[in-house]
Structure formats: C-alpha cells, structure tokens
Amino acid sequence: HTAAQDNCTCPTNKMTVCSPDGPGGRCQCRALGSGMAVDCSTLTSKCLLLKARMSAPKNARTLVRPSEHALVDNDGLYDPDCDPEGRFKARQCNQTSVCWCVNSVGVRRTDKGDLSLRCDELVRTHHILIDLRHRPTAGAFNHSDLDAELRRLFRERYRLHPKFVAAVHYEQPTIQIELRQNTSQKAAGDVDIGDAAYYFERDIKGESLFQGRGGLDLRVRGEPLQVERTLIYYLDEIPPKFSMKRLTGGGSGGGSHHHHHHHHHH
C-alpha cells in the first residue's frame, strides 16, 4: 500500500501505528485496537475506526465531546467485533453477554438479546441519507454550486465513486446528501458508502480522521459552509427486526426501515 514513505504515516487514518517493517522495508500501518493492517491509499473501514477509537485511553480520547453520548440507546459508540476484512460482524455482544444484530454500518437493527441471539448475515445498508442544517451565512448558497461542491468533496476527499452520490437536496438551511450503493453495484476497490459517510460525519464534527490535515474547509464559491446539526438515516436492504413496542414507542425510528444517529453541533 502507499503509506507515506518519508515519515511512514497513514494519510487516510491517524488512528494507526506505522513502521517500515513491510515487505522490502516498506511502511506498514496497523489500526489501533485491532492491530489489523490497513490500506492507506483508501478509507479505513468504520468497524476498525470504531475499534481504534474505543481502544484509546479514556484520558487520551481528546476527540470525544459530550454530544457523542446523545446517540439513541448510546449505540453509536461501542467496541465492535470486526471480521478479517475489517467489516462489522453481524452479531455484536458486550461484556455482559448482551447481544444484538447490526447492519453493514454497525448500527443496531434488532432488539437486544442474549448469547443465543442469531444474526444469520450482515445486512447491507444500501441507502444513507445525511441531513445537515447549515449555519446562517452572509451569502446565500446556489443549489447547483452546492451540489457540485459536495459531489467534489465525496469524490476527492473520500474517494467515493460519483455514481454512489445519488442526490443533493437543498432547502435553506437544510442540505440532504443521498448515498446509494447496492451489493451488486459495489465493485472490488470501491469505497463503501458507510465508510464515506462515517469519515464525513467525523469531518463535520471537527474530528477529522485524516492524518495531519486541518479541519474540513467546505466552500461554495468561496462562501464557507458551517454545519450546525447532523442527522444520519440508514436504510437497509432487508428491513430491521424491532419489536412493535420500539416501532411505536417513539424510540429512535424515523420509520421502521430507518435507523438514525442524532448528533448536535454547537
């Protein structure tokens, strides 16, 4: 892989330990927490990133802010089990033997159970809706300019193929970015929409995962875009299996097929 040879760091993942002990003395980087080798020419999987984040000592986790804990059921931040490819294992369990099934972006898609809970397959999240509210700006944003800039961002910064950015909607001050990627559409080497969405989510919270880069500076014809609030909805190829109590009781649901993380930005 192409980690920077001169100082042996991973441009796409600061949560790594790198050393020149690869084949032929090449720089090799391993994710914190899992120790898995990562490809520094592309995004690291969300599972490995979450694992790295949870492995950091509590007092060293300077990126975590109180808003992190405003996630429904506190499911957004946990120490996941990842498979050898770095993907989420379909079943996740905590230290007290409470288990649940997750989708490909690691979001819980069933009620919590015990060790007897079966999760037959990792269900793919094929549609992600990123809902943003931007701060009032001195100059208005033109929809087509905003669309072009966000598509450029996902293509250049997150290396997501343009065909997976399905749409950008804008009704001031709300911006919606739709990412779509079916199993059949995702070719080898394609960045996963779940990973791109996670990098974007961290970027807009000022917690960039990229090595040595400053905060994300997003401009539309020179006018900076600042994000006040983010809401991310995940739609799975197979509907989730929650009890009726959860679906009707005002839990996290934005409809039975949606999971959402609710983050506040101040």
Epitope: R135, P136, A138, G139, D203, I204, K205, G206, G214, G215, L216, D217, L218, R219, R221, G222, E223, P224, L225, Q226, V227, H265
Partner: antibody, heavy 122, light 106 residues
Framework: QVQLVQSGAEVKKPGASVKVSCKAS????????INWVRQRPGQGLEWMGW????????KYNEKFKGRVTMTVDTSTSTVYMELSSLRSEDTAVYYC???????????????WGQGTLVTVSS | EIVLTQSPATLSLSPGERATLSCSAS?????IYWYQRKPGQAPRLLIY???NLASGIPARFSGSGSGTDYTLTISSLEPEDFAVYYC?????????FGQGTKVEIK
C-alpha cells in the same frame, strides 16, 4: 507562523489607481480567504471585500464595486487589492486579513497584515 | 446593512478593574467577533463566534450575547489592555464593524 506582509506606503493623486499587495506565509495559501479592510483617519474599520485563492471567488462591498479589484497570484502566495478613481476620502490605512473557516466554525479575521498607508493628495 | 453600535464610546478605568463593552446590532445576528487595536498596530482578533477565545488570548477576555446584544468583558484590566475594541458581524453583506470603544486609563 501565519503571517501577512503588505507592500509599502503610497502617495497618489486624485483620479489615479493604487495597487496594494499582501504576501501570505505559514499556512496553505489556497485554504483561506483574504479580506481587505481600511481605516480612514479618525474613523472606524470598513470592510472592502474578500477573495478566495483556491478558485478566485470574490465578494466586494457594494460601496466599492466598480472601483475595487482583488486578484491573486498563487505562485507567490500574494493577493492584490487595486482601488481606482482615487479621491481624498480614500486616504486610509489598508489592511489585508486572513479569514480561516472550517465546517465547524468561522474563526474570524486573524492575522492581519501590518497595514499600508495610502495618501491621496493633489 | 447591519449597523453595529458600541457603547460606551470611551471607558475610563484603572488597572485591575472590570471592563464591560457593549455591541448592539440594528438587526439580529448569529455571532459577533471582537478585535483589539492599539495605536500604530494592526487589529488583533480576541473573540470569534461570540464567546470563543482566539489563540493566544488571555482568559481574562470573554464574550457573550445573542440576537442584537453582545458583550465583551475584561475581568481584570492589565496595562496592555488599554486600547480600542471593535465588534464585527458576519451575518450579512456588507460585513460591518462597530465604531469602537476606547478603553483608557483613568
């Protein structure tokens, strides 16, 4: 450290033009816009406009539209502000200032250049 | 255009005293920025986004407010704090500054 260095003082006749330069260093030049602000003797601060070096986008104060032109030379990390049809009321200290912004915050104008005194006198 | 009115125009205080500077906007703004200017020097950013301290600025400076009324407070004046202070808005074009408050030694 981030630094903006401006060109020296100028004396101009009414009706002439002046071009002030602002050379940036210590940061990625294309990542922040450069604003121009002037201060007339005994007056407050007056914003003239900004230019964003990455794509050349600019925004001018309507008050100066038609008289002000901001340009950028990315090869030398320099921004220029040209003011034409000068009159005595344009006698002022002209400052360039960097505005750093991310998706999280607008961090204001910081730092400022040392200022360039432009005197318009017949 | 949004007009920012600063008060008082001049504030005469002694070192160690608390200084409270006001900035009133002609229409609601979301954030205010504060700058300090000393004679013969360029302005210096003190506060961004209403209440955040700029890099290298001492903690005795603080900002607050919302809507149309904003305040810069210097908890205990140091000799180097005697200067002119300006507020600025980034809510709508043209960007505007207040006319300034001069903090002078009593």
């Amino acid at each position: 450290q981030v630094q903006l260095v401006q060109s020296g003082a100028e004396v101009k006749k009414p009706g002439a033009s002046v071009k002030v330069s602002c050379k940036a260093s210590g940061y990625t030049f294309t990542s922040s816009d450069i604003n121009w602000v002037r201060q007339r003797p005994g007056q407050g601060l007056e914003w003239m406009g900004w230019i964003y070096p990455r794509d050349g986008s600019k925004k001018y104060n309507e008050k100066f539209k038609g008289r002000v032109t901001m340009t950028v030379d990315t090869s030398t990390s320099t921004v220029y502000m040209e003011l034409s049809s000068l009159r005595s009321e344009d006698t002022a200290v002209y400052y360039c200032a960097r505005r750093f912004a991310t998706v999280v915050s607008n961090y204001g104008l910081d730092p400022w250049g040392q200022g360039t005194l432009v005197t318009v006198s017949s | 255009e949004i007009v920012l009115t600063q008060s008082p125009a001049t504030l005469s205080l002694s070192p160690g005293e608390r200084a409270t500077l006001s900035c009133s906007a002609s229409s609601s703004v979301n954030y205010i920025y504060w700058y300090q200017r000393k004679p013969g020097q360029a302005p210096r950013l003190l506060i961004y986004d209403t209440s955040n301290l700029a890099s290298g600025i001492p903690a005795r400076f603080s900002g607050s407010g919302s809507g149309t009324d904003y305040t810069l407070t210097i908890s205990s004046l140091e000799p180097e704090d005697f200067a002119v202070y300006y507020c600025q808005q980034w809510n709508s074009y043209p960007l505007t500054f207040g006319q300034g408050t001069k903090v002078e030694i009593k």
